[in-house]
């Protein structure tokens, strides 16, 4: 199957724009706009910090760690109430991301 110019292959995404919201003090919110052509049962999400089509249930049930959000070799843990996740580096440093 041939794709027309600007058409995305099923199950893929591309980044369109990247802008930052500085309205909330002490919090950095990066807004990345992506265009995705997701298959049935998938929605636009993230895998390894890149836009990707992911199983809709992962996001709806907030199972963030199933989206491979941490780097290879890092451990992923859900925050209380699944409000985000932490990535634990091999040496024990943690990086926390919250989802509003």
């Amino acid at each position: 199957q041939f794709l027309k110019e600007g058409q995305l292959a099923a199950g893929t995404c591309e980044i369109v724009t990247l802008d930052r919201d500085s309205s909330q003090p002490r919090r950095t919110i990066a807004r990345q706009t992506a265009r995705c052509a997701c298959r049935k049962g998938q929605i636009a999400g993230t895998t390894r910090a890149r836009p990707a089509c992911v199983d809709a249930r992962i996001i709806l049930q907030r199972w963030w760690c199933q989206m491979e959000l941490c780097l290879e070799g890092e451990g992923c843990d859900l925050l209380i109430n699944r409000s985000g996740w932490t990535c634990t580096q091999p040496g024990g440093r943690i990086k926390t991301t919250t989802v509003s």
Epitope: R26, L79, T86, Q89, G91, G92, I94, K95, T96
Partner: antibody, heavy 114, light 113 residues
């Protein structure tokens, strides 16, 4: 609002042991790491060490042995300093260490003098 | 031993000008991009400007731009303002399992002419 405040800094004599406390509010120490950083008068920033929940603290090579970082409650992290010398005179800061260090406490001044 | 070399140690700029500060690490930072930049004014704690080499922290002017990866990083301040007079520090993150977790550069003092 996320905040850190250091306390315990004072004038001490060489050889003294001193413990500084970093009290946090607005975020959970179970989800974030904290670093201690010091700055001698008119000098640059010097990283001392880092602690994350449920993990052993990590120290700068020069700080190992004389400095101890511990999480003492759900809202406090201590920095214990032994055998203080005049070279340890500095403002001591704690900071939430996540994607960069932010926010920082205002700092607490430790003066070591005979 | 981990080392972050910041150059120059001091720099002067006119209002409206552009300033470039360099930071070189003795080994690659974690994930090749875990480097932050801070601004510090006398009597105040440092303020985070940029993290992950190029991501602007909340509320920071877009006149501040970070770039680089691995061991070489740059902070560029464009359209310099009087309020930018301060000391700037780079801070690298390294794997805690093999070395010091963090290290700071020696600082660059910016004077506005």
């Amino acid at each position: 609002q996320e905040q850190l405040v250091e306390s315990g800094g004072r004038l001490v004599t060489p050889g003294t042991t001193l413990t500084l406390t970093c009290t946090v509010s607005g975020f959970s120490l179970s989800s974030y790491g904290v670093s201690w950083v010091r700055q001698a008068p008119g000098k640059g920033l010097e990283w001392i060490g880092y602690i994350a929940n449920n993990y052993n603290p990590h120290y700068a090579s020069w700080a190992k042995g004389r400095f101890t970082i511990s999480k003492t409650s759900s809202t406090t992290v201590d920095l214990k300093m032994t055998s203080l010398t005049t070279e340890d005179t500095a403002t001591y800061f704690c900071a939430r260490d996540n994607y960069g260090m932010d926010p920082w406490g205002p700092g607490t001044l430790v003066t070591v003098s005979s | 031993e981990l080392d972050l070399t910041q150059t120059p140690s001091s720099v002067s700029a006119a209002v409206g000008g552009t300033v470039t500060i360099n930071c070189q690490a003795s080994q690659s930072v974690y994930n090749n991009k875990n480097l932050a930049w801070y601004q510090q004014k006398p009597g105040q704690p440092p303020k985070l400007l940029i993290y992950a080499a190029s991501t602007l922290a909340s509320g920071v002017s877009s006149r501040f731009k970070g770039s680089g990866s691995g061991t070489q990083f740059t902070l560029t301040i464009s359209d310099v303002q009087c309020d930018d007079a301060a000391t700037y520090y780079c801070q690298g993150e390294f794997s805690c399992s093999s070395a010091d977790c963090n290290a700071f550069g020696g600082g660059t003092e910016l004077e506005i002419l």
